[in-house]
């Protein structure tokens, strides 16, 4: 019989007034020794699922089912995956800004439009939250004698094409 | 609860400039994005421009690009629209709006408006 | 350019009547659909967003429908605090656009 509560492990609980270390009741856990009483372990249930099973040491953890992911701390709200033309912040799924989008559902970041005119092209299909722009072929203005240098893929040599 | 206010607006001549401002409060406006629409007078609703949360992606229609500059100053809640080489056509209300977080890009809340009238 | 052309651009409708205001998008916007109504002298209020969800605060007549690339919004029983002018916006492809409005009047 002890006659102090500090010598106590996790996983047990101890009354000052009875200084003994008692194990703690199922489904109750203690992380701390000499605590006077055990903490009740968190359920998984409806849309969280377990995942990590509580012990006398530790509590349960929990994760959000399919189809949903966490928010807060320690998982303490299940949300609705986020859908295509969003993405995923502290605080929720976000709305893709004007100019961004993601095409995946439940992942991803957005991300910004192709600038079709980097490449010297235009903009076949506008962008969407969902969807990227759409670029079409370079844009080439033939005036009369023009070249163009061709340069074959793989290859460094360039053929020079007179356009007359 | 969630205010727009508007300023800045008035009469200037063509070529020349103006900055409206919108202040808002009631909500965390560093989270949102933001956007201008415009109404001409005895016309339909116009989207100007759209700037998201951090400011770094500003997006404008066609005929305001190169002319119109939509800022942010999230310490201060404020929304701006920089609006040079003024036209005839841009005359219109001007109305500040908040873009929902998680919806489906809809404007939730809009300011009561601000006048813009571009003539000589 | 997404268009979307709203109609009727205008209608008279009685009291307690059934409205529906329809926009057609030119091409496919999902559900990135959304209604306003404006009073005279004031600025838009959103009705519904995402094609048929009720905004906080607005009444149940009020209820948003589409079929293919056809949006509606329907007012089930039409009250005085109804008129006013109708929008339709798609926020799904840039620019976003609005249509053409319906104006609304009692009979």
């Known amino acids: 019989v002890q006659n102090s509560c500090d010598n106590c492990q996790p996983g047990t609980f101890c009354r000052k007034y009875n200084p003994v270390c008692k194990s703690c009741p199922p489904s109750t856990f203690s992380s701390i020794g000499g605590q006077p009483n055990c903490n009740i372990c968190r359920v998984c249930a409806g849309y969280f699922r377990f995942k990590k099973f509580c012990s006398s040491t530790h509590n349960a953890e929990c994760e959000c089912i399919e189809g949903f992911h966490c928010l807060g701390p320690q998982c303490t709200r299940c949300e609705k995956d986020c859908r295509p033309g969003q993405e995923l912040t502290k605080q929720g799924c976000k709305t893709c800004s004007l100019g961004t989008f993601n095409d995946q559902n439940g992942t991803g970041v957005c991300r910004p439009w192709t600038n079709c005119s980097l490449d010297g092209r235009s903009v076949l299909k506008t962008g969407t939250t969902e969807k990227d722009v759409v670029c079409g072929p370079p844009v080439v203005s033939f005036s009369p004698s023009t070249t163009i240098s061709v340069t074959p893929e793989g290859g460094p040599g360039g053929h020079s094409l007179q356009v007359l | 609860d969630v205010q727009l206010v508007e300023s800045g607006g008035g009469l200037v001549q063509p070529g020349r400039s103006l900055k409206l401002s919108c202040a808002a409060s009631g909500f965390i406006f560093s989270y949102f994005d933001m956007a201008w629409v415009r109404q001409a007078p005895t016309k339909g609703l116009e989207w100007v421009a759209s700037i998201s949360p951090s400011g770094d992606i500003p997006y404008y229609r066609d005929s305001v690009k190169g002319r119109f500059t939509v800022s942010r100053e999230n310490a201060k809640s404020s929304l701006y629209l920089q609006m040079d080489s003024l036209r005839s056509e841009d005359t219109a209300t001007y109305y500040c709006?908040?873009?929902?977080?998680?919806?489906?890009?809809?404007?939730?809340?809009w300011g009561q408006g601000v006048m813009v009238t571009v003539s000589s | 350019d997404i268009q979307m052309t709203q109609s009727p651009a205008s209608l008279s409708a009685s009291l307690e009547e059934i409205v529906t205001i329809t926009c057609q998008a030119s091409q496919d916007i999902g559900n990135w659909l959304a209604w306003y109504h404006q009073k005279p002298g004031k600025s838009p209020q959103l009705l519904i967003y995402?094609?048929?969800s009720l905004a906080d605060g607005v009444p149940s007549r009020f209820s948003g429908s589409s079929s293919g690339s056809q949006y509606s919004l329907k007012i089930s029983r039409l009250q005085v605090e109804d008129i006013g002018i109708y929008y339709c916006?798609?926020?799904?492809?840039?620019?976003?656009?609005f249509g053409g409005g319906t104006k609304l009047e009692l009979k």
């Open positions: 916006l798609q926020a799904y492809g840039a620019p976003w656009t």
């Open positions: 709006a908040r873009r929902s977080y998680g919806g489906y890009s809809e404007l939730d809340y």
């Open positions: 995402g094609t048929s």
